[in-house]
């Protein structure tokens, strides 16, 4: 058993049918010695008396808010949560496996640049009685500071019969140098509590590996005289690290017909312009990627050919 | 990814082309190592990230773009005290500063070259003959060093008398390649920045 926060405790259980569970001793936070009784949740049934209460915690029915009273007055509370260990592996019931970039990916994180700011998000089908708390650091043995905000519900989607909820959090490394070469990964830890179930999820990454630039901005077409060709131009996104001559991007320019089946023409360039043939009803799209470290491509910025 | 490679302009900062070749070569070598050594811990998540140049060179600091010298977090680990001197900050692109940056890059390349050659000698003794260093990568390191045109004492190749532990050598190769790729990215950024200046 360990303390998650004041008056909230997590009981770790080896989870299998007929498991013996864990013996837990609760102590009433009071100078009083006599006339103390214990109850669980809203029930008025007295579970025991005395300054300490010994319970065998086996199932969720044994978890909850234990309260010690004296003469109708509440003295203190202890909330017991359960953390299930199933065959040596901590349960992952609360969050959905996003399966990207690999199986057992519960937390996904992205950064728009090298400033040390990043966003993480996760999915769940649970809509109520759910709380999250996020901590982060650079390295784990001698951790350096990363400050995270509160996790917020950022999207709701319908998937088949189920509703899916997306939560996200923004974090900022306290003293980040964009040019630094990372040798210690960022660690992100999410505590999730659903009703009386506790779970924790972690992700470890280097900022360089989660970079996904914003799409190029100011995408424009300039028709070339007496030609089907057009000059496409764009700019670096505002959110990208500066100076751009140091933090350079490379670009992919795509000409896509109205039909998804039509052949796509693609050109790669390090410049912020390209000359392409503009077909009728086609659209031109441009996306960006770090020129020197191949992390994710940005989403496409698009303009119609007409 | 195989992208069309732009040929450098004749007037272009001469090292840029070599640094781009270096990054391409080390990235290819790392990819080959990860595939060949699939049963060894060779991915970024599995290895310890060690920097053999730590406390010996200060490339990131010496080559910091002028625009980032205002960032406290980029300055706090600098041993090169003159960088923080106001007059030097103002003339960041002076030949003195550039020389310091390029000599630091040269020292990095020299250290990695020695390590890679020593390692290759060990790998050639492996009866499994599982993996060797790409000669192209070693040649590209050499070309960039020549283009940088610094003279410094030659570091003797480390020779080891004891029987090599091939498992450890292959893991060390992975560690070295990961670190060198990161340094090659920094070198490429620096060359691009200097070329634009």
């Amino acid at each position: 058993i360990w303390e998650l926060k004041k008056d909230v405790y997590v009981v770790e259980l080896d989870w299998y049918p007929d498991a013996p569970g864990e013996m837990v001793v609760l102590t009433c936070d009071t100078p009083e010695e006599d006339g103390i009784t214990w109850t669980l949740d809203q029930s008025s049934e007295v579970l025991g008396s005395g300054k300490t209460l010994t319970i065998q915690v086996k199932e969720f029915g044994d978890a909850g808010q234990y309260t010690c009273h004296k003469g109708g007055e509440v003295l203190s509370h202890s909330l017991l949560l359960l953390h299930k260990k199933e065959d040596g592996i901590w349960s992952t019931d609360i969050l959905k496996d996003q399966k990207e970039p690999k199986n057992k990916t519960f937390l996904r994180c992205e950064a728009k640049n090298y400033s040390g700011r990043f966003t993480c998000w996760w999915l769940t089908t649970i809509s109520t009685d759910l709380t999250f708390s996020v901590k982060s650091s650079r390295g784990s043995s001698d951790p350096q500071g990363v400050t995270c905000g509160a996790a917020t519900l950022s999207a709701e989607r319908v998937r088949g019969d189920n509703k899916e909820y997306e939560y996200s959090v923004e974090c900022q490394e306290d003293s980040a140098c964009p040019a630094a070469e990372e040798s210690l990964p960022i660690e992100v830890m999410v505590d999730a509590v659903h009703k009386l179930k506790y779970e924790n999820y972690t992700s470890s990454f280097f900022i360089r590996d989660i970079i996904k630039p914003d799409p190029p901005k100011n995408l424009q077409l300039k028709p070339l005289k007496n030609s089907r060709q057009v000059e496409v131009s764009w700019e670096y996104p505002d959110t990208w690290s500066t100076p751009h001559s140091y933090f350079s991007l490379t670009f992919c320019v795509q000409v896509q017909g109205k039909s998804k089946r039509e052949k796509k023409d693609r050109v790669f360039t390090d410049k912020t312009s390209a000359t392409v043939i503009c077909r009728k009803n086609a659209s031109i799209s441009v996306r960006a990627q770090d020129r020197y470290y191949s992390s994710s491509w940005s989403e496409w910025a698009s303009v119609p050919c007409s | 990814r195989n992208l069309p490679v732009a040929t450098p302009d004749p007037g272009m900062f001469p090292c840029l082309h070599h640094s781009q070749n270096l990054l391409r070569a080390v990235s290819n070598m790392l990819q080959k190592a990860r595939q060949t050594l699939e049963f060894y811990p060779c991915t970024s998540e599995e290895i310890d990230h060690e920097d053999i140049t730590k406390d010996k060179t200060s490339t990131v600091e010496a080559c910091l773009p002028l625009e980032l010298t205002k960032n406290e977090s980029c300055l706090n680990s600098r041993e090169t005290s003159f960088i923080t001197n106001g007059s030097c900050l103002a003339s960041r692109k002076t030949s003195f500063m550039m020389a310091l940056c390029l000599s630091s890059i040269y020292e990095d390349l020299k250290m990695y070259q020695v390590e890679f050659k020593t390692m290759n000698a060990k790998l050639l003794m492996d009866p499994k003959r599982q993996i060797f260093l790409d000669q192209n990568m070693l040649a590209v390191i050499d070309e960039l060093m020549q283009a940088l045109n610094f003279n410094s004492e030659t570091v003797p190749q480390k020779s080891s008398l004891e029987e090599p532990d091939f498992y450890k050598t292959k893991i060390k190769l992975c560690i070295l390649l990961h670190a060198f790729r990161i340094r090659a990215v920094t070198i490429d950024r620096v060359m691009s920045y200097l070329n634009a200046s």
């Epitope: 080896d14 299998y16 049918p17 065959d87 592996i89 019931d93 057992k104 089908t125 | 049963f39």
Partner: antibody, heavy 115, light 112 residues
Framework: QVQLVQSGGGVVQPGRSLRLSCAAS????????MHWVRQAPGKGLEWVAF????????YYADSVKGRFTISRDNSKNTLYLQMKSLRAEDTAVYYC????????WGQGTMVTVSS | SYVLTQPPSVSGTPGQRVTISCSGG????????VKWYQQLPGTAPKLLIY???QRPSGVPDRFSGSKSGTSASLAITGVQAEDEADYYC????????????FGTGTKVTVLG
């Protein structure tokens, strides 16, 4: 004590269907994940499928994906394996089993796919 | 396709020490716990070892398990005639959990 009693096995022709049941008692069935494991005659153990305690997630071996469906009725304390498009290579003793460090197995039920 | 490899058979005379190996990889045994089962002819498997080296109550202490790196082993010290059976190791893979990964199985024969 924990008990898992299996039923539903038998002889079936290739291409036909069969449903296996596993009745649980002696524990809170709705709190635990469940597996199906099979063993072809003279062969080793092969995992078939898993279902979460609440039925929200199901996992299958590639060899049965799209043909077999694992399900559970927590109100009846029963686990099921619906097998469709049966093949000769599905011939095996099928076991249900609880998920956890200490597990309990059903007695097994024989499924023979033969024309 | 079994990812956990066991020797097809091992044998020993009563009182001898018999060991069965189970070889895997970094993503299975290297990252997860190992279990061992005993299966007597015509019966369901019986758990002998969980959590690499833990014995459930009721399992004789002549059975012991261990794990090192990407391999595990089961030892029977002082093998007895009633130990003649098939033995299976089981683990999980990091990427496919909760799918059970079983070993190829080992037939233990007690001679004499």
């Amino acid at each position: 004590q924990v008990q898992l009693v299996q039923s539903g096995g038998g002889v079936v022709q290739p291409g036909r269907s069969l449903r296996l049941s596993c009745a649980a008692s002696g524990f809170t069935f709705s709190s635990y994940g469940m597996h199906w494991v099979r063993q072809a005659p003279g062969k080793g153990l092969e995992w078939v499928a898993f279902i979460r305690y609440d039925g929200s997630n199901k996992y299958y071996a590639d060899s049965v994906k799209g043909r077999f469906t694992i399900s559970r009725d927590n109100s009846k304390n029963t686990l099921y394996l619906q097998m469709k498009s049966l093949r000769a290579e599905d011939t095996a003793v099928y076991y249900c089993k609880t998920h956890g460090s200490h597990d309990n197995w059903g007695q097994g039920t024989m499924v023979t796919v033969s024309s | 396709s079994y990812v956990l490899t066991q020797p097809p058979s091992v044998s020993g005379t009563p009182g001898q020490r018999v060991t069965i190996s189970c070889s895997g990889g970094r993503s299975n045994i290297g990252s997860n716990c190992v279990k061992w089962y005993q299966q007597l002819p015509g019966t369901a498997p019986k758990l002998l070892i969980y959590g690499n080296d833990q014995r459930p109550s009721g399992v004789p202490d002549r059975f012991s398990g261990s794990k090192s790196g990407t391999s595990a082993s089961l030892a029977i010290t002082g093998v007895q005639a009633e130990d003649e059976a098939d033995y299976y190791c089981q683990s999980y893979d990091r990427g496919t959990h909760p799918a059970l990964l079983f070993g190829t199985g080992t037939k233990v024969t007690v001679l004499g």
